[in-house]
Interface confidence: low
């Protein structure tokens, strides 16, 4: 029986149940090769509290649909007197990167995971030529996730003192030159994640091969190598390679661009100081405030919630967007869709789509950018669930009693972007 996601096969993936201090290793095509879980375990559970291992999914006992992968075991679990078997269930949703499996919950018998990934999309529009896992867990089982840095088109220009060359990189995946109008990148060879531009010529100096690695608690490393056998004539017989070290800064700061720190015989070393290299709990919250013990800032957007059925309205030419953030008040237009952002077609107001649901909320403050994300909306034709990204700016003189209003700025592949100037986005440093 075919596994529906071959692009996820090359790696053993990790997911964590932080509440119970459990690390899962997942290999959806082969086995995880952890001796303690046996030779054919596809999902191996490592309980760090008891220091025990259990196979909770066997690679041979696999059943699959387009959006669900189940691994059974032969281990019994008594659930209300019935003789069930322990199993793992992975629900797949369309995403714009390879993504990461996320632990959802576990019962006595079933371990549930959810995975938003390009592999689950109905169309190939988000698929890369080459992409590698872009997250790691540290020894405290905290997640460091660079997926938000992955560019679906275009690339990052590396800060370099050489006026004759420009080095462009992407994170964890190749540079999509077809979707990018930038003329400099057009010449980059397909598959390259590190492209060196000299005059009118562009050279592949690295492709992603292995996933992201953790070298210290605050340092992540990504290595690219040139797969093609032919040597470049300006590399003195050496094969090009690129090492990008992502550094979590010791204190809150604005974002920086990647900097070239060393170059020798086409071996490029890049350092990128970015808060995305920090653990996710430092950057994100599922509520509308960031002020927990993990974060060293104080942000509270809850005053932006609207009560009494009213919503913020943002004009998007063909569509009107109704927004109700930081609450669970139904938007009247949105037909009980539990939408935080609702898209209504002006020419036909019966065409209503949820562009993100209030249960699927993430507030993120990273590299000086404050962003509220709502995902899990109605599906587009690609299979991608509509989502909305609201970028907040501090404005102490915002109208509407300081709340301000959201402004629609555009849509890319069923992701809707808004900016919102408000006094509630003014970040306060937390007292030590």
């Amino acid at each position: 029986q075919a596994a529906p996601f071959p692009e996820l096969c090359s790696y053993t993936w990790e997911a964590v149940d932080t509440k119970n201090n459990v690390l899962y290793k997942i290999n959806i095509c082969g086995s995880v090769d952890i001796v303690q879980c046996g030779p054919s375990s596809a999902v191996c559970m490592h309980d760090l509290k008891t220091r025990t291992y259990h196979s909770v999914g066997d690679s041979v006992l696999r059943s699959a649909t387009r959006s669900l992968l189940e691994f059974n075991t032969t281990v019994s679990c008594d659930q209300q007197g019935t003789n069930h078997r322990v199993q793992s269930s992975i629900a797949f949703l369309c995403g714009k990167t390879l993504g990461t499996p996320e632990f959802v919950t576990a019962t006595e018998c079933v371990h549930y995971f959810e995975w938003r990934t390009t592999a689950a999309c109905k169309k190939d529009i988000f698929k890369a030529n080459k992409e590698v896992p872009c997250y790691v867990f540290d020894e405290e089982l905290r997640k460091h996730d660079l997926n938000p840095l992955i560019k679906l088109s275009g690339a990052y220009l590396v800060d370099d003192s050489d006026p004759d060359t420009s080095l462009f990189i992407n994170v964890c995946r190749d540079i999509d030159t077809l979707r990018d109008p930038g003329s400099q990148l057009r010449a980059c060879p397909p598959g390259t994640a590190a492209c060196l531009v000299r005059g009118h010529q562009a050279f592949d100096v690295g492709q992603p091969r292995d996933g992201l690695k953790l070298v210290r608690k605050d340092r992540l490393v990504l290595s690219y190598v040139r797969e093609e056998a032919g040597k470049l004539d300006f590399c003195d017989g050496h094969s090009p390679a690129v090492t990008i070290t992502f550094v979590c800064p010791s204190e809150r700061r604005e974002g920086t661009i990647p900097k070239l720190t060393a170059k020798s015989n086409c071996r490029y070393e890049i350092e990128w100081i970015t808060e995305y290299a920090c653990h996710r709990d430092y950057l994100e919250s599922k509520t509308c405030s960031l002020s927990g013990e993990q974060q060293d800032v104080s942000i509270d957007l809850t005053p932006l919630a609207q009560s009494g059925g009213s919503s913020y309205i943002s004009d998007g030419k063909e569509y009107l967007f109704y927004l109700n953030v930081c609450g669970e008040t139904e938007i009247q237009f949105c037909n009980k869709k539990q939408a935080a952002v609702c898209q209504v077609k002006k020419s036909d107001t019966s065409q209503v789509k949820a562009a993100g649901r209030y249960h699927n909320q993430t507030l993120r403050y990273s590299d000086g950018d404050l962003t509220l994300i709502y995902f899990g909306g109605d599906e587009c034709s690609s299979g991608f669930q509509r989502m909305s990204v609201i970028n907040f700016e501090c404005n102490k003189t915002a109208g509407n009693d300081g709340k301000g209003t959201p402004v629609f700025t555009g849509e890319v592949d069923c992701t809707y972007f808004f900016t919102w100037d408000t006094e509630y986005a003014c970040v306060k440093e937390k007292e030590d």
């Epitope: 075919a2 596994a3 071959p6 096969c9 082969g30 086995s31 090769d33 041979v60």
Partner: nanobody, 118 residues
């Protein structure tokens, strides 16, 4: 359609040896890994040994470690199981499994009977 054919089974005395072979008939294909399973009467099918072609790694179930050796020829999609110092509890039908690279389909052989008498 890919078909796997096991051979080499038979009746052997305890302490004896057998070499099982699993080879494809029909079109060839490249495999992700190949494995030997066995099923004794009234018991669940269990994995015996597996070889991963990508890195050559092998795994054995605890009860056969040091007695059984899995090997193979990736180019021919052929896998062998050398069984030595056989015990009566090794009596079972032995099945071969191949998981293909492209479609990740699983292909099973028909099985070959191994009987170890005391």
């Amino acid at each position: 359609q890919v078909q796997l054919q096991e051979s080499g089974g038979g009746l052997v005395q305890a302490g004896g040896s057998l070499r099982l072979t699993c080879a494809p008939s029909g079109r060839t294909y490249s495999t992700y890994w190949m494995a030997w399973f066995r099923q004794a009467p009234g018991k669940e099918r269990e994995i015996v040994a597996r070889i991963n072609w990508s890195d050559g790694s092998t795994f054995y179930t605890e009860s056969v470690k040091g007695r059984f050796t899995i090997s193979g020829d990736n180019a021919k999609n052929t896998v062998y199981l050398q069984m030595t110092n056989l015990k009566p509890e090794d009596t079972a039908v032995y099945y071969c499994l191949a998981r293909t690279v492209v479609s990740l389909d699983d292909y099973w052989g028909q099985g070959t009977q191994v009987t170890v008498s005391s």
